[in-house]
Amino acid sequence: ESGYAQNGDLEDAELDDYSFSCYSQLEVNGSQHSLTCAFEDPDVNITNLEFEICGALVEVKCLNFRKLQEIYFIETKKFLLIGKSNICVKVGEKSLTCKKIDLTTIVKPEAPFDLSVVYREGANDFVVTFNTSHLQKKYVKVLMHDVAYRQEKDENKWTHVNLSSTKLTLLQRKLQPAAMYEIKVRSIPDHYFKGFWSEWSPSYYFRTPEINNSSGEMD
C-alpha cells in the first residue's frame, strides 16, 4: 500500500512513487502569483507529506505549500520568475523527490469567460466572442486560444479552431441547419512563456437557423 511508515522508518517511503506535476498562474490575484502541485498517483498517502519550493524567490530562500485536500498550493508575490526553483516533496526534514522548474515554463492561463455567439443574418455567419483576464496582465498577455464546437448530438466530434484574437467568425454554410451546437474555448501561453492549456470556459449553446426552402438559405 502507498504511504510512508508511521514509525519514522523511511524505508517504505523511498519505495513509493512520489512523482508530481505543478502549474503556475501569474498575476492570478492582482500582483499575486500561484503555484499548484499534485501527485500523479492518486493513491499516494499524503498524510504527512509536504511540498516546499526553494530558490528563485524574493526575500526568502524557501516557501511551504498549503495543503488543500489532494493538492498543494501557494499564493505569493515572492516568485522571482527568473531562473529555476527547486520543488521538493518532504516528510519532516527529508526530501523524497525534487524537481528543478522555471515557473515561467509551467504557466496555466485562467480560463476564458463571457463566451457568446451572435448570428448575423445579412452576412450569413456567426460571430464568436469571448474574454480573457490576460489582456490586462503584465506578463502572460499573449495567448493561443482553442475554440472547440460540435453538434450537440455528436458526442466526440469536436471541430477545433486555433486563433490569437478573441473573436472568430463561423460561416453558416459550414454548419448544419436547424441544429443545436455547443461551443467552448481554452487558452495556452504563446509568447515567451510556456505551459499548459487552461481549463475550458463554460460551454455556450446556440441553434442554427432552418433552411429557407425557396432560396436554399437558412432562416
Epitope: L57, E59, L80, I82, D102, T104, T105, F193
Partner: antibody, heavy 117, light 111 residues
Framework: EVQLVESGGGLVKPGGSLRLSCAAS????????MHWVRQAPGKGLEWVSL????????YYADSVKGRFTISRDNAKNSLYLQMNSLRAEDTAVYYC??????????WGQGTLVTVSS | NFMLTQPHSVSESPGKTVTISCTRS????????VQWYQQRPGSSPTTVIY?????PSGVPDRFSGSIDSSSNSASLTISGLKTEDEADYYC?????????FGGGTKLTVLQ
Amino acid sequence: EVQLVESGGGLVKPGGSLRLSCAASGFTFDDSVMHWVRQAPGKGLEWVSLVGWDGFFTYYADSVKGRFTISRDNAKNSLYLQMNSLRAEDTAVYYCARQGDYMGNNWGQGTLVTVSS
Amino acid sequence: NFMLTQPHSVSESPGKTVTISCTRSSGSIDSSYVQWYQQRPGSSPTTVIYEDDQRPSGVPDRFSGSIDSSSNSASLTISGLKTEDEADYYCQSYDFHHLVFGGGTKLTVLQ
C-alpha cells in the same frame, strides 16, 4: 563540455558604441538565464545585466540602465550586450555567465572593452 | 539596496585553515542564497560554493560555506590550504533581480 566564448571587445572613444557577443555550447542554452558581469582593471566583479531564458525578462544595474541592452538569440545559442554612450568607467573585462541551476556555474574567458579618447 | 563587505585580504600558511567572511549591510543574510567564486590571477571566476553551502562537483571538500544569522554574514572556509588556493574570492547574493557581489578578498598562501 560547457563553453562560453565572448567577442566584440576593443578600443572605443567615449560616447561610442560596441556590441558584445557570447557564443554558448555544451548545454541547453534556451533553458538558461544568462548574465553579463564586468571587472574593471584591478577591481572586483560588478553585475551588469541578466536575461531570462526567453528574452522576456531583462534587468540592468543602475550604472548601465538606459545605455546598455541585453538580448539573446536562442536559435543561434548566442547572448548579446549592446553598449551605447560608453564612458571611461565602462572600461572592463566583460564576462558572460550562465546561471543554469545556480548562478555562475559557468563563465566565459571575458572580452576587454577599453573606453578612451 | 544592500552591500556585501569582505576583508580586503587574508593570509595563512599551507595546511592551515582560513575563513573569509561576507557581511550583509542591511536585510537578513538568510533572505537569499550566497555564492562564492574563486578567481585565480589572469583567469575567469569559477564557483566554489553555491546556495550557501553546496559544492559543485569537482570542488574539493576542503571548501565549505556557512551562514551565521547572528552576525548577518556568510563565510567561506578553506581547510588544508594549498598554494593553488591563492586567488581572489568573491561572495555574491541577490537583491530582487539584481546580483550583488562583495568587494573580493585576496587570499595569500604564505611560503
